[in-house]
Structure formats: C-alpha cells, structure tokens
C-alpha cells in the first residue's frame, strides 16, 4: 500500500468544504524520485493540491475542496505512471443534511389488529442514511411525568409508519409518543403526542342493508328508501354517531350527507330523493361523544327509490267514426303538473255503468296516446287515467256530447317559416273554455289517423303557432274546434302551405301557324303538383336577331298566344316563363323563322 488518504470528515453538510491529505511512503519512490501527487473527485482532476516532502522522506499532498456539492463521490489520490493514472488510495465522501423534524405525527388504534398504528411525514430528503424510531412511554397523567418506557418501534426501511402491538399498550391511559430521526449529521425529534389509544380508535363501518319488506309494513313513499345497517360487531359497545352519504348513480351529482345518525338504527327511511332513481349509499361512523377517528366509508349499497303515481293533467280529444258513431277514437296528451311528474307506464280508459256500484269496465289499456273503442249505448262519459307501479293519476272525465256551441269565424292560416304555420281565428261569443287544433296532410294525402293535435287552454286565444310535424312543400289541413263547458262548437278547417315550391318546369312551346309577320304558339299546361302553389301567370319572351327582346304577360289559364309585328324572313328565339307565388321557371327555347315576303302563309 503506497499511499493513504485521510479526510477532515467523510460526511459533511452539502456545500461545505472538506480537506484531505494523501501521504506516499518512501518505499514507493521508485516510481519517481519526485512524484507529483494528483487529486481526482469522481472522474474530474482537482487542482489546488499543495505537495511537500516530509522529514521522514514521505511525500504529502493536501487539498481543500471549497464546496462539496455531490451527495456521494469518490476522492482519489493518484500518480502519473507512464501514460496512465495510478490510483494510490481513495475514500468515499458523502454530503447531505441533518434530518428535519418529522411532522404530522398521527396515530390510529385498530381494534381488529389490536395495535396502535402511527405515521408521520419524514421531511425533505437528507441524502444520507437516516433512521426513524417511534418512541413512547406510558404515563398516568397528561404525559408530563414519564412512566414505563415502551419498546422502540423501528419501521421497515423506507416506511414512515410503525405499529405498536397490544402488549405494549395500555387502553384508557395516556401514552407519550414521538418520532426520532437520526443520521450522521444529527438527530431531530417530532413534537410529542399525548394520547389514550382509545381516543384515536378507528372503527370499521357498519354494513348497509336494504330493509326486507314485511307484509304488514307500509311500502316506502315515493322518493324514499328504507334501509338499515348492521353495526360492526366488535365496536358494538362503543357509542358512535354515523353519517350516510348518497348520490344518484347516473349523472354528475356530488354526494349529499345525512347525519348525525344513531349507530343502532334498526331501520331508517331516507326521504326527499328523486323517485324511480337508482342511488348509491355509504355509511361511516365515529366514536362519539368520546374522541375517535371516522371509519372508512362502508361498501356501497345500491337501491332504487319507489316511483310516484303520475301527477299529470290529461288533455283529451275524441272523434266518432262516420260510419259507426258508437266507435270512438280518443286522443290524449299528458301535461306534467310538477317538475317530476312520475313515469307513465300506460293509460286506461274505463266506464262505470250506472246502477252497478263499484263496477268499472275497462274499455282499453294502452301505452299509446290514443285508442279506439266501442262506446256502450248508455255511456255518455268515460274516465281516463295514467298509471305506473305506484298508482294512477286523477281520473280525467271525457264527456261525449253533441256540438251545440257557437262556431269560431274567420279561420285563416299563414306560413311563418318552412317548419311552422300560424293559424288564427276570431273567437265566438261567448268565449269558449279552450280550443282543439288538429293538423295533418291535406288532400290527396289526408288521413284522420295521422293528425297532430294540441289543446289550447286559453279560451280568449285568437291563434296558435303550429310547430310540430310541419314540412315545407306540403299542403296541410288545419281544423279548429271550440270547447265549451259541456259541449263543443262546430269544427272549421283551412288549408295552407308552410313553404311552396316554384313550378318545376314550364310547358313546352309548340308552333301551330306561322306567317310573314306573325306566329301562333300553343302549349299544354303542367298538371297541378302537390306542394306547388298554383300558377299566377305566364310571361312569354321573344328576341330577334338584333337581340331586341319583347314580352307579354298572360293569365294562368292561357293555352296559346299569337306573336304579331314580326319581321318577315327573320329569326326569333322564344321561351315561356310559368310563375307562381313561390317563384318562376322557364321553358326550353323555341327558335323559328318568319316567312319571306313572296312565300305563302303556313297553317
């Protein structure tokens, strides 16, 4: 061993200076009578070594590194030997920080494992091997006087928690607990906790269960859930308060908290929820009124609230078959009376024969918004209800009466845009209670079964905007019927388009007769097309060889036209424009030549 390094300290604060000396023994001088000692930190040569020969013939080099900024590095003492660097000795240097004070020390008593689990935050990285020890002692009072020490608890490497087993614990008696951190640069201690293990007990949560429905118990109300919880048996004798949280399974709703609740609720009804909605529920508990920690939330229970009977108004309308007046087609529309009006599973139309107390005869049961049934000869009225699993809506009476009320007048309709029509009228006197407005395709596509209808509850209304099932270029029939207390007025109807189409083509022009200065033209009108407004007029255009244009407007019933004042032996271009309120279309161009002066007329 030729050389030996000694250092002021192998472990220092990061950034602190360090001094090292390297001594080469005399018996190594054969390498070089005046060897030059070099220093290397890691892979980098370090200048600044001060070398001297000592009295005993040994060579010494001393170096001071002003700042050790590496957390770990090897310092080497070397000699140049040939072309290579020969390492004589090396030492490991470490730099870091003394341990910070561990903080946020907290403990939980786990009754299942019978141990006190304490955890802490170790603080910033020291870059040095640092050991943590959980230290504790038993105390009769408030930890001012130290009783028996408890065996140190040393966590596994890298862990910031430790378990004190039951044999070292005394329940209902205070313990002093703290964490000590230690490394080569120093020792630190956390603030001391003084606690009774039972005051930091963390219980297991109860198990949530749904209530088994019993025959004598009333079913839960709409928007309510019946549930119960089974306390965690080992914690049964600990007074606790609990809280429940719930949220709908669908949507982004946050948890709603309910509490405090008793641990021992054998059954609990949770209300104020949305009807017919699936909910997720969880419960947790805490020792109370004595101190403790909240348990974790229990596993989720998923329950569905009962639905409420439909709360709707049913607007109704009916029609009799012309061939069989006892066959009635009844239509209805549910109008919600509340924000959550309940799910509708179906509808029932029924009739109660007079003299048969309690007897109700169903005429139809459907999920549709209409039904056709045969009205018994003595029946003047039926009842309509909406139903679901929770019950029925209030019955809506439907009275079948003659049209005895006054009619409305001046029914008219106009397009608002391609998808809506405004229908207006003058109300009769006296005011009706409301109106039924029906609309559907007019002839030739008319069909009673495909009509859309709406109830206007305001008897003073003078019009209604039709926005449903309106398409452009279709002819609609609109029927309005006034409704009175026990009867109705005669229905009125009007036809209208929301948007009409321009003619798709103008008739082809044909030359019938021609002369020197005239030409007789004719055409066959296009047959009327559904969705296209009727022609308002034709315009005929003709242009001579000099590009002079002439035109004449003809009425829509015209079938031909004679052009007069033409030049003999001249070329003309002629076309017909067919026009309606929705636009105009040109025919193809007819080109003709008038006869020469000496030629005879053509007929």
């Amino acid at each position: 061993e030729c050389g030996h390094i000694s250092v002021s300290a192998p472990i220092v604060h990061l950034g602190d200076p360090i001094t090292a000396s390297c001594i080469i023994k005399q018996n190594c001088s054969h390498l070089d009578p005046e060897p030059q000692i070099l220093w290397r930190l890691g892979a980098e040569l370090q200048p600044g070594g001060r070398q001297q020969r000592l009295s005993d013939g040994t060579q010494e080099s001393i170096i001071t590194l002003p700042h050790l900024n590496h957390t770990q590095a090897f310092l080497s003492c070397c000699l140049n030997w040939g072309n290579s660097l020969q390492i004589l000795d090396q030492v490991e240097l470490r730099a870091g920080y003394p341990p910070a004070i561990p903080h946020n020390l907290s403990c939980l008593m786990n009754l299942t494992t019978s141990s006190l689990i304490c955890q802490w935050e170790p603080g910033p990285e020291t870059h040095l091997p640092t050991s943590f020890t959980l230290k504790s002692f038993k105390s009769r009072g408030n930890c001012q006087t130290q009783g028996d020490s408890i065996l140190d608890c040393v966590p596994k490497d890298g862990q910031s928690h430790c378990c004190i087993p039951r044999k070292h614990l005394l329940l209902y008696q205070n313990m002093g607990i703290w964490v000590q951190a230690e490394n080569a640069l120093g020792t630190s201690m956390s603030p001391q906790l003084c606690l009774d293990p039972m005051d930091v007990v963390k219980l297991e949560p109860p198990m949530l269960r749904t209530m088994d429905p019993s025959p004598e118990a009333a079913p839960p109300q709409a928007g309510c859930l019946q549930l119960c919880w089974e306390p965690w048996q080992p914690g049964l004798h600990i007074n606790q308060k609990c809280e429940l949280r719930h949220k709908p399974q669908r949507g982004e709703a946050s948890w709603a908290l309910v509490g405090p609740l008793p641990l021992e609720a054998l059954q609990y009804e949770l209300c104020g929820l949305l009807p017919a909605t699936a909910y997720t529920l969880q419960i947790r508990c805490i020792r109370w009124p004595l101190p403790g920690h909240w348990s974790d939330w229990s596993p989720s229970l998923e329950l569905r609230t009962t639905e409420r009977a439909p709360t709707v108004r049913l607007d109704t309308w009916w029609r009799q078959r012309q061939l069989d007046p006892r066959t009635v087609q009844l239509f209805w529309k549910p109008v919600p009376l509340e924000e959550d009006s309940g799910r509708i599973q179906g509808y029932v139309v029924s009739w109660r024969p007079s003299g048969q107390a309690g007897a109700i005869l169903p005429l139809c049961n459907t999920t549709e918004l209409s039904c056709t049934f045969h009205l018994p000869s003595e029946a003047q009225e039926v009842a309509l209800v909406a139903y679901n699993s929770a019950g029925t809506s209030r019955p809506t009476p439907v009275v079948f009466s003659e049209s005895r009320g006054p009619a409305l007048t001046r029914l008219h309709a106009m397009a608002r845009d391609p998808h809506s029509l405004w229908v207006g009228w003058e109300p009769p006197n006296p005011w009706p209670q409301g109106y039924v407005i029906e609309w559907g395709l007019g002839p030739p596509s008319a069909s009673n079964s495909n009509k859309t209808w709406r109830m206007e509850q305001n008897g003073r209304a003078t019009g209604f905007l039709l926005k449903e099932n309106i398409r452009p270029f279709q002819l609609y029939e609109i029927i309005v019927t006034p409704l009175y207390q026990d009867t109705m007025g005669p229905s009125q109807h009007v036809y209208a388009y929301s948007q009409e189409m321009a003619p798709s083509h103008a008739p082809e022009l044909h030359l019938k007769h021609i002369g020197k200065t005239w030409a007789q033209l004719e055409w066959v009108p296009e047959p009327p097309e559904l969705g296209k407004s009727p022609l308002t007029h034709y315009t005929i255009f003709w242009t001579n060889a000099q590009n002079q244009s002439f035109s004449a407007i003809l009425n829509a019933s015209s079938r031909g036209f004679v052009l007069h004042g033409l030049e003999p032996a001249s070329l003309y271009h002629i076309h017909l424009m067919a026009a309606s309120q929705a636009g105009a279309t040109n025919s193809t161009v007819l080109t003709l030549m008038t006869l020469t002066p000496e030629g005879s007329e053509l007929h």
Epitope: K167, P231, H237
Partner: antibody
Framework: EVQLLESGGGLVQPGGSLRLSCAAS????????MGWVRQAPGKGLEWVSS????????PYADSVKGRFTISRDNSKNTLYLQMNSLRAEDTAVYYC???????????WGQGTLVTVSS | DIQMTQSPSSLSASVGDRVTITCRAS??????LNWYQQKPGKAPKLLIY???NLQNGVPSRFSGSGSGTDFTLTISSLQPEDFATYYC?????????FGGGTKVEIK
C-alpha cells in the same frame, strides 16, 4: 362511585312472570350498554341479555329469547328484565352489569335470586 | 356461536406460586377476551379486559396475554386473597359467552 342495585327477585311458579330492576348511580347511565348475567346454583356464569345505551339494540341468549325482555329508562337510571313463562332452569342469581366499550362487564351488582319452583 | 373452553377446571396451588389459566375460543376473537374473579357468595369482578389490559385497582401480579383463539391469565405470585374461581369471556360479538370457570384452591 359506581353502584348497581338489583331488586325484584323471589319465588315464582313455573309459567309465571317476574320483573327485575337495577338502579344505577355514580356514572352517566345513558352512555353505557348494560346487561344481565345469571348464575345457577353451583354453576358458572351465563350471559342473558344486553341493551345498548339508547335501548335500540337488545340481543338475547337463545335460552331466553321470546320469553325475556330487557329494557331501560335513562331518565330513571334504571335497567329492567321482564321474565315471562319462567321455567325451573331459570332459577339463578341474576346480576346486573355495566358494560365497557370493549364488551367487558366492568361493574356488577350484588345479584338478586330468582327461584322458579312449584 | 363462539364457545369458550377453560382449563384446568380446577387447580391447587400455594401462596407465592405462579399460576397460569388458559382459555380457548372456538374461533378467532382478536383481543376481545376478558377475565373475571369470583369469590363464593360475591359478584364477579373484572380483572383483565381486551386480553391484556389491567382493570383499575387490580394488582399488577395479574396479567393477560394471547390473541386470536388462545389466551392466558397469569398470577405471578399467588396471594391468599386470590383463591377464587376465574372466568374468561369473549366480547367480540353476541351471544356473549363465558368459559366454564377455573377454581383455584389452596394446596
């Protein structure tokens, strides 16, 4: 000082009824579970029933289920055991006890003797 | 239901002896095991709760150990006032159950 004082024991014919009472003092009665434990002559201890601090939970031993009813009146600091359809095997000293948070019987009354015999 | 088995059912010992009584549960009960002492004609008295916690006022010669299914009550140096019957009891759940008892008599 915690005190539990049982009363209501005595001689009763098989099929008869008896109501035991336990007057508690020296602690906040409404915060603790209470219970009844019995000991037949010359035999070991047998748990009979317990009741939670508010009275909502009342477990029973199979041997007395359906015949005995435990109850409490927190305003009177009193625990009760209503015993119906008594049998000869119900003969025992009945102890009232205060329970701790870990289910231990922390304090016991002096006991009251119930004798079921014709 | 959880059964508690105590052994021995009786033992004879002298003052100053170290006495050990065991209690076995038919299934794991964590540390929910309590020990009671009863003297003839008297009510039972709690000695140890939660397997190893000494009840206030109980001499330190009494100690408890064990967890799960096997538990031990130890009297380190038997005193004249310790001659009595000792019972174990599980309190992890209902129905609550006691061991059959161990009678400690003077040798």
């Amino acid at each position: 000082e915690v005190q539990l004082l049982e009363s209501g024991g005595g001689l009763v014919q098989p099929g008869g009824s008896l109501r035991l009472s336990c007057a508690a003092s020296g602690f906040t009665f409404s915060l603790y579970w209470m219970g009844w434990v019995r000991q037949a002559p010359g035999k070991g201890l047998e748990w009979v029933s317990s009741i939670s601090s508010s009275g909502g939970v009342t477990p029973y031993a199979d041997s007395v289920k359906g015949r005995f009813t435990i109850s409490r009146d927190n305003s009177k600091n009193t625990l009760y055991l209503q015993m119906n359809s008594l049998r000869a095997e119900d003969t025992a000293v009945y102890y009232c006890a205060k329970l701790g948070e870990l289910g231990q019987f922390m304090r016991w009354g002096q006991g009251t003797l119930v004798t079921v015999s014709s | 239901d959880i059964q508690m088995t105590q052994s021995p059912s009786s033992l004879s010992a002298s003052v100053g002896d170290r006495v050990t009584i065991t209690c076995r549960a038919s299934q794991g009960i964590s540390s929910y095991l309590n020990w009671y002492q009863q003297k003839p004609g008297k009510a039972p008295k709690l000695l140890i709760y939660y397997a190893s916690n000494l009840q206030n006022g109980v001499p330190s010669r009494f100690s408890g150990s064990g967890s799960g299914t096997d538990f031990t009550l130890t009297i380190s140096s038997l005193q004249p006032e310790d001659f009595a019957t000792y019972y174990c009891q599980q309190s992890i759940g209902y129905p609550g159950s006691f061991g059959g008892g161990t009678k400690v008599e003077i040798k």
